[in-house]
């Protein structure tokens, strides 16, 4: 009747998976902080910078206590997908001014992509319901000027930094509940 079944496949410890996700997130957080500082030095610009197409911050630090694992990972994945899309757009349409940051933006995009794959893996390891495929997002309009591209870059990096900071706190808190 065929070979005897092998030993059941042991899923890796979800806490270990969560640990490596935290490490990746923290690393990306520092990358983003350093890249934003570099951008501000190259193109000094006063005030806060906003971009309507960016996701709103998922959660205030004070509300972290009420978080549940599926919700956090689903929301984090959705937000990071949006930031990945924005970084890709920035590299493609940001204009010649941002070309000086090309190696760093490329590295940021690759690490963001890696973190998203890690989140996907974590969700399957934890047997969480997989989110439906993302609906096609409307294309982002190119910046109206070189300065518009710089302001967009500052907004994207600022928002990504806040999101990753929230993510680290949330993931560490969730780890204690596993």
């Amino acid at each position: 009747p065929g070979p005897p079944p092998g030993p059941p496949r042991v899923s890796p410890d979800p806490r270990a998976e969560l640990d490596s996700t935290v490490l990746l997130t923290r690393s990306l957080l520092a990358d983003t902080r350093q890249l934003a500082a570099q951008l501000r030095d190259k193109f000094p610009a006063d005030g806060d910078h906003n971009l309507d197409s960016l996701p709103t911050l998922a959660m205030s630090a004070g509300a972290l206590g009420a978080l549940q694992l599926p919700g956090v990972l689903t929301r984090l994945r959705a937000d990071l997908l949006s930031y990945l899309r924005h970084v890709q757009w920035l590299r493609r349409a940001g204009g010649s001014s941002l070309k000086t940051l090309e190696p760093e933006l490329g590295t940021l995009q690759a690490r963001l992509d890696r973190l998203l794959r890690r989140l996907q893996l974590l969700m399957s390891r934890l047997a969480l319901p997989q989110p439906p495929p993302d609906p096609p997002a409307p294309p982002l309009a190119p910046p109206s000027s070189a300065w518009g591209g710089i302001r967009a870059a500052l907004a994207i990096l600022g928002g990504l930094h806040l999101t990753l900071d929230w993510a680290v706190r949330g993931l560490l808190l969730l780890k204690t509940r596993l």
């Epitope: 640990d19 935290v22 490490l23 990746l24 923290r26 690393s27 957080l29 520092a30 902080r33 350093q34 890249l35 934003a36 500082a37 570099q38 501000r40 030095d41 190259k42 000094p44 560490l172």
Partner: antibody
């Protein structure tokens, strides 16, 4: 050879002010972020402040926020720390330090330090 | 803030012995953001090991670093008289940048 030389330390009364300087040589000063780190007598190291090469991003330790101001003059290859509302607990040797590579925020090279004593 | 705890506080060894210094971090940190410094009495600190395991310029091969996550180690394979000093670990992943309280390596 990278050289960092601090100056401006001394005795000051609580509530007083002092301005520390750090003269840099042996590297392209305008390409590197700089830190101030302090060490109270017989104690460990405490990071105080960081400034990026172009001065557009600055971070402070909570213990000095609102009282200390880090600044730099790239034309003069100089780093500064303006210290106001000084307290006894600010007594320490103050070191300036250069990061390892641009924007990596490390502490690769250190000056010899300047002693600040806050006492009445 | 991320807290670094070094152990032991004091380590008494003889020249030629192996020294193992530990640095425990309150949160998980990526290994590229953990560094070690050496400080001798009356002198400024100097960078010893950066990014967990890379020796800084001019640092002898007897110094090595290892670790990941929350547990990091500085090892001196065979102590020389000039190695007796205070050693600090430091994290650079998060602001505020923080140091451990130091391990004093003294002659037995």
């Amino acid at each position: 050879e990278v050289q960092l030389v601090e100056s401006g330390g001394g005795l000051v009364q609580p509530g007083g002010s002092l301005r520390l300087s750090c003269a840099a040589s042996g590297f392209t000063f305008s390409s590197f972020g700089m830190h101030w780190v302090r060490q109270a007598p017989g104690k460990g190291l405490e990071w105080v402040a960081y400034i990026t090469p172009g001065s557009n991003t600055i971070y402070y330790a909570d213990t000095v926020k609102g009282r200390f101001t880090i600044s730099r003059d790239n034309a003069k290859n100089s780093l500064y720390l303006q210290m106001n509302s000084l307290r006894a607990e600010d007594t320490a040797v103050y070191y300036c330090a250069r990061e390892y590579s641009s924007y990596d925020e490390g502490f690769a090279y250190w000056g010899q330090g300047t002693l600040v004593t806050v006492s009445s | 803030e991320i807290v670094l705890t070094q152990s032991p506080a004091t380590l008494s060894l003889s020249p030629g012995e192996r020294a193992t210094l530990s640095c425990s971090v309150s949160d998980l940190i990526p290994s590229q953001y953990l560094h070690w410094y050496q400080q001798k009495p009356g002198q400024a600190p100097r960078l010893l090991i950066y990014r967990t395991s890379n020796r800084a310029s001019g640092i002898p091969a007897r110094f090595s670093g290892s670790g990941s996550g929350t547990d990091f180690t500085l090892t001196i394979s065979s102590l020389e008289p000039e190695d007796f000093a205070v050693y600090y670990c430091q994290q650079g992943v998060d602001v505020p940048f923080t140091f451990g309280q130091g391990t004093k390596l003294e002659i037995k």
